[in-house]
Amino acid sequence: TPLGPKWPEPVFGRLASPGFPGEYANDQERRWTLTAPPGYRLRLYFTHFDLELSHLCEYDFVKLSSGAKVLATLCGQESTDTERAPGKDTFYSLGSSLDITFRSDYSNEKPFTGFEAFYAAEDIDECQVAPGEAPTCDHHCHNHLGGFYCSCRAGYVLHRNKRTCSALCSGQVFTQRSGELSSPEYPRPYPKLSSCTYSISLEEGFSVILDFVESFDVETHPETLCPYDFLKIQTDREEHGPFCGKTLPHRIETKSNTVTITFVTDESGDHTGWKIHYTSTAQPCPYPMAPPNGHVSPVQAKYILKDSFSIFCETGYELLQGHLPLKSFTAVCQKDGSWDRPMPACSIVDCGPPDDLPSGRVEYITGPGVTTYKAVIQYSCEETFYTMKVNDGKYVCEADGFWTSSKGEKSLPVCEPVCGLSARTTGGRIYGGQKAKPGDFPWQVLILGGTTAAGALLYDNWVLTAAHAVYEQKHDASALDIRMGTLKRLSPHYTQAWSEAVFIHEGYTHDAGFDNDIALIKLNNKVVINSNITPICLPRKEAESFMRTDDIGTASGWGLTQRGFLARNLMYVDIPIVDHQKCTAAYEKPPYPRGSVTANMLCAGLESGGKDSCRGDSGGALVFLDSETERWFVGGIVSWGSMNCGEAGQYGVYTKVINYIPWIENIISDF
C-alpha cells in the first residue's frame, strides 16, 4: 500500500486507479494511507471519476475513511438517490490521516476509466466548531499553522488544561460599611474551574450582616452536599455553608467585623451564581441632644461606630468648649458606644467692653454693661471742641463678635477737633495792634528752637508754619520746643508739645527768596482740644471770596513791637489785603530783587504803614472769618516784608495757603 510522503516534507500528491487513464481491471483492491503532520488535515478532490454504478456501490467503489469513520463510499459518474459520486466535492480527513480504498469486483458490464484524485495537507482550524458542539476554548481561540491556543479575558487565567479560563477572583477586600459582591459574571453563568476568595474587613467594633439577593443558582447534587460547586462563609467565630442549589440562603448576622467568602467551581455546568448585599452594624452611641441655640447635623435615627455629627450654632451664638471658642465641632462615635468629644455649648456672642474713644465717650443703650449679640452702644464726641467723623456713632454687637457701625465699619469713629473757633468777635474796622484775650487765637503756637517763631495748630497733631522758621531744625525735629494754650510768651503755664517730624515744602530754597515758604510739623502726640487750644480751619475752595482786596485778615504773634522787643503778651493786628499788583510793584525797587512777590504770596497791611507783622511772628497765621460757616480759617502764613516792619508803602507778605491745600492734605494723609 503506497503511503504519502513523510512530513516535514510537503504532503501533497496524486492518486489514480490502476491503469488510469485506461480502464481498470476486475478484482482490483488498492489502499492508500495518507498521513499529515499533527495539527494538519488532508484535503482530497477528484479530477476524474468513472466507476461502475451499483446499488449502494456494492460492486466497484472508492471508500474514504479517517480513523474509524467512513467519510464516503463513491461509485458511478453522478450521484443518485442512493449512490454518491464525488463530483466537485472536496473531502477532508477528521484528523491527520486519510485512508483511500479502491475495489473492483469480478466483472464490468462496460469499460470504466477509474479515477484521478489530488490530495494535500492543510492546517486544521480548531477554532471553528460545528453548531451545538462545545467551543474549543472558554474565551478566545487563536488558530495557527499546525495547532491553536486559548487565551482569557482580563480578570481570568488559563487553567492548566489549556482550554478553561479560571476567574482571578481572590484577594478582593471590601472595607466600606456596606456593599455588594457577586460571583464572577453574575447574572451570567459563572466561570469553571475557579476558586474565589472575597474578604470583608471592617474596623473593630462593626458586625457584618450578609443578605443573599436577587437569585441564587449554584450547581448541586440530589444526594451529596454540594460536591461540584459551593459557596462557604467563614468568620473568626464560625463557618456557614457550604451553599449550593437554587434556594436563596437566609440572612447571616456574623457578629464579626471580618468575613471570608469562598466560592469554588468545577469544570462543568452552566449556572448563574449568587449576589450578596452586605451591611454592618455596631453599638450605637447616645443620641446627641443639641445644646440650646444650636442644632445637630446630620439628623439620623441612630449613630453607630464611625458615624459623626456636627453642631451648628444659631446666628449670634458661638461654639464654646468650656470657655474656649471652637471654629467647628464634629464628634465621632467610638467602638465602645461613646462619643469622642463632649458636647459643646452655643454661647451668645460677646463683643466685650467697647474700646475707649479718644476725645469721646461711649454709652450703653441696651442696658448697663450689656455687650452681647445685638446690644447697642452709642459713641459721642466731647461737645463744642470735637465733632464725629465717618458715622453716627451707633454700633451694634454683630455675630462675628465685633462692634459694627450702621455703615458696616468695625473701626472706631473719629472725634475730630472742631476748627476755627474763637472767643473774638470782630467789627469791620481796623484796630491798632492789641493784646489778645484768652480764647481769641486758640490755634496760636509758639515755636522755640534757636529763634522765636509761630505756627498754627491743624487738627490735633499738626502745626502749620513757615519753612524759613523751622529750616534749621528740619533734620532735628526733637529740638523744637512747641508751646500752646498760653497768651504770655514767658509763662510757665502752657501745653507742651514735641515734634515727631518736620516737612518743608520741596519747592522752598533757603536764603533764595521766600517762594513756597510753608512747612508742616507733625506732633508726636495728639493735644487735648479746649477753649485755649483749638485748630485753625484750612480754607475751603470758596475761601477766595473772603480774601479779596481790602478784606480784613488778622495776624497774631509774639514778634517785635514798635518798641523793638518781642511781645510778652500775644498781640494781634487786623489788616486789609493789598492788591497783588500794588504789592508786587512795592517790592520791585531795590534792595528787593525783581520777582520777589510771586503768585504763591499775598500781601496785607496799610499803605500808611504802622500795622504789620514782624520778626518773631514768622510762621503765624493770617486768619479770616468765613461768614458762611462762622469759622476762622488760615489764609496766609507770616513770611517776609520790609526790613522795617510797618513801613509806609511796604506791606507784610504772607504765604498763600489756598495754593497749598493738596500739598498739606497729602502730607497729613501719608503720615
Epitope: G322, H323, P325, K327, D350
Partner: antibody, heavy 118, light 106 residues
C-alpha cells in the same frame, strides 16, 4: 487697664517645688469668659503652655507635666497660683502669666525668670 | 500633643510682604492665634481666631487658615515688625505653640 504681674522665687534648687503667683487687675477672675494661663519660655527657645484656669474654675494642664502642676485661683485677692513640683535645671525659663479671652492670650505679664540650680 | 511647625526664619526687605506659615494636621478645623515677641519683651497677640486683629494692631497684619496651614501676612513690612512670631492653637482645651519664626527686615 488690664495688667498681670508674676511673683515668686528667682532661684530654686533641684527637686524643690516652685510656687508662682499672678496678681491681676482690670478684669475679674469670677465672671465672664476670662481665663488665666501660665506659659514658660526657656532661654532662646519657644513658648510652652503649662496650664490655665477659667472663671468657672475649669482647669487644664500640659499633658507631659500634668503630674507636677497645680493651678488655683483666689478671686478675693485677684490672684492665680501655679505650683510645680520636683524642679529640674531643664525647667529654667521665664514664666509668664497671661489672660485668655476669646481663645487668644491677649494680655501678658512681664514674666519672671526662674533659675533651677543647686 | 499635636505639633505646629513654623519655618525657623524669614527675611524680607522693607515694604515687601512677609508670609509666615504654621502647619499642623487639620489646623484649618481649629482657630489659629499669632503672637509677636520682640527681644526682651513679653509676647503680644497680633491675630486671633484666624483673621481677627486686636485693636491697636496695624491693618498691614492679616491672617488666614485652611486645610493644614495657617498664615500670618504682613504687607508693607516695616523695620519695627522685626521680631519672633509664634502661632498657637487649642487642642482639647490645651494650648499648643509653634516653634516660632524669626522675621528679619533687611
Amino acid at each position: 487697664q488690664v495688667t498681670l504681674k508674676e511673683s515668686g522665687p528667682v532661684l530654686v534648687k533641684p527637686t524643690e517645688t516652685l510656687t508662682l503667683t499672678c496678681t491681676v487687675s482690670g478684669f475679674s477672675l469670677s465672671r465672664g469668659k476670662m481665663g488665666v494661663s501660665w506659659i514658660r519660655q526657656p532661654p532662646g527657645k519657644a513658648l510652652e503652655w503649662l496650664a490655665h484656669i477659667f472663671s468657672s474654675d475649669e482647669k487644664s494642664y500640659r499633658t507631659s507635666l500634668k503630674s507636677r502642676l497645680t493651678i488655683s485661683k483666689d478671686t478675693s485677692k485677684n490672684q492665680v497660683v501655679l505650683t510645680m513640683t520636683n524642679m529640674d535645671p531643664v525647667d529654667t525659663a521665664t514664666y509668664y502669666c497671661a489672660r485668655i479671652r476669646a481663645g487668644g492670650i491677649d494680655y501678658w505679664g512681664q514674666g519672671t525668670l526662674v533659675t533651677v540650680s543647686s | 500633643q499635636p505639633v505646629l511647625t513654623q519655618p525657623p526664619s524669614l527675611s524680607v526687605s522693607p515694604g515687601q510682604t512677609a508670609s509666615i506659615t504654621c502647619s499642623g494636621e487639620k489646623l484649618g478645623d481649629k482657630y489659629a492665634y499669632w503672637y509677636q515677641q520682640k527681644p526682651g519683651q513679653s509676647p503680644v497677640l497680633v491675630m486671633y481666631q484666624d483673621k481677627q486683629r486686636p485693636s491697636g494692631i496695624p491693618e498691614r497684619f492679616s491672617g488666614s487658615n485652611s486645610g493644614n496651614t495657617a498664615t500670618l501676612t504682613i504687607s508693607g513690612t516695616q523695620a519695627m515688625d522685626e521680631a519672633d512670631y509664634y502661632c498657637q492653637a487649642w487642642d482639647s482645651s490645651t494650648a499648643v505653640f509653634g516653634g516660632g519664626t524669626k522675621l528679619t527686615v533687611l
